[in-house]
């Protein structure tokens, strides 16, 4: 025997009363599939979340983050504060990258400049808080009289971070 509830379309739920099989979802609730026994409460985009798509009787609201924050997690379930390039987020707020490290994103953490000498190369362009160094040809490849920029840089061997 077919379940009578299976006839209830999205946007409705299956009532217990025999005379009233399919009941529209009440305000601020939805059902996205047919045959549901109850409607789900709409997601509310509050605080650092803002509404990207309003809730309807057949689909949940969708949120994103307010300016100055970025989404994390499925369906933007979390918002994390942005920082500027050249910074990283700590509990005390956005902090500039330490000398010898950089961050080219508005999120994430600073990481050390590449140590060009580990690859037998020289520094072509100095690193900054926002950008990694650019490595050039090895010192031996440079023509006589040419010099490369060689600022002090922390080692960037795998597994080692600046302290």
């Amino acid at each position: 025997l077919q379940d009578p509830c299976s006839k209830c379309p999205a946007g409705t739920f299956c009532g217990k009363n025999k005379n009233q099989i399919c009941i529209p979802c009440p305000p601020n609730s939805f059902s996205s599939t047919s045959g549901q026994k109850a409607c789900d409460i709409c997601r509310q985009c509050k605080g650092v979340f803002r509404t990207r798509k309003e809730c309807s009787s057949t689909s949940n609201a969708e949120c994103d983050c307010t300016p100055g924050f970025h989404c994390l997690g499925a369906g933007c379930s979390m918002c994390e504060q942005d920082c500027k390039q050249g910074q990283e987020l700590t509990k005390k707020g956005c902090k500039d990258c330490c000398f010898g490290t950089f961050n080219d994103q508005k999120r994430g953490i600073c990481r050390p400049w590449t140590n060009c000498s580990l690859d037998g190369k020289s520094v072509l362009v100095n690193g900054t808080k926002e950008r990694d160094v650019v490595c050039g040809p090895s010192p031996a490849d440079l023509s006589p009289g040419a010099s490369s920029v060689t600022p002090p840089a922390p080692a960037r061997e795998p597994g080692h971070s600046p302290q």
Epitope: L72, G73, A74, S77, M78, E80, T90, K91, Q105, G108, I109, R111, P112, T114, D132, R156, P158, G159, S161, Q163
Partner: antibody, heavy 116, light 108 residues
């Protein structure tokens, strides 16, 4: 949608080498850290290390430094965890997770069994 | 590196409040995050940055963090909350993530 899909379960003998993988999709793989987390049978979560796929910079937990190698190939959005010589004590579930502090997406886990 | 200590187990009657502690030297100076793990599943964030709750996580979950202790509180605990819970923090000394040993929450 964002997904991290890990390679299948492995059964190995002590002394053998192994490389397991974690393929990311649905986001800019190069610009998010990937961490590896170990869970031995019936035990808790242990953070092993992380990699920034954009430039393959790695950072290890002192407990795992020199024991494993983390790498990535950003061209195929895949991170790797490898051992050169497995031990019975490496038997565990290994998870990859996106992030360095907040791990917002996790792989399904790769079960590694090392037994003679 | 910082060490995070959790009680191995906590038991609570349905409808009661469960509190799971996570202690570590000056953990209040760092963000604490909490994960729930059910058998055979990957962990899921239930609290991030000390006190923030991801959407989709019930309002009964809350968190706090100050001094040497971070706390996960589950008010009106339900049977479905039975799981292992892990605290974690990212430390800028060593640039590593540390997990607590985990707490098995049993709903009686």
């Amino acid at each position: 949608q964002v997904q991290l899909v890990q390679s299948g379960a492995e059964v190995k003998k002590p002394g053998e080498s192994l490389k397991i993988s974690c393929k990311g999709s649905g986001y800019s793989f190069s610009t998010y850290w990937i961490s590896w987390v170990r869970q031995m049978p019936g035990k808790g979560l242990e953070w092993m290390g992380k990699i920034y796929p954009g430039d393959s910079y790695t950072n290890y937990s002192p407990s795992f430094q020199g024991q494993v190698t983390i790498s990535a190939d950003k061209s195929i959005s895949t991170a790797y965890l490898q051992w050169s010589s497995l031990k019975a004590s490496d038997t565990a579930m290994y998870y990859c997770a996106r992030g360095y502090g907040i791990f917002d997406y996790w792989g399904q886990g790769t079960l590694v069994t090392v037994s003679s | 590196d910082i060490e995070l200590t959790q009680p191995p187990s906590v038991s609570v009657a349905p409808g009661q409040t469960a509190r799971i502690s996570c202690s570590g030297d000056n953990i209040g100076d760092q963000y604490a995050h909490w994960y729930q793990q059910k058998p055979g599943q990957a962990p899921v964030v239930v609290i991030y940055q000390d006190k923030n709750r991801p959407s989709g996580i019930p309002e009964r979950f809350s968190g706090s963090n100050s001094g040497n202790t971070a706390t996960l509180t589950i008010s009106g605990t339900q049977a479905e909350d039975e799981a292992d819970y892990y605290c974690s923090t990212y430390t800028f000394v060593g640039f590593t993530t540390v997990f607590g040993g985990g707490t098995k929450l049993t709903v009686l």
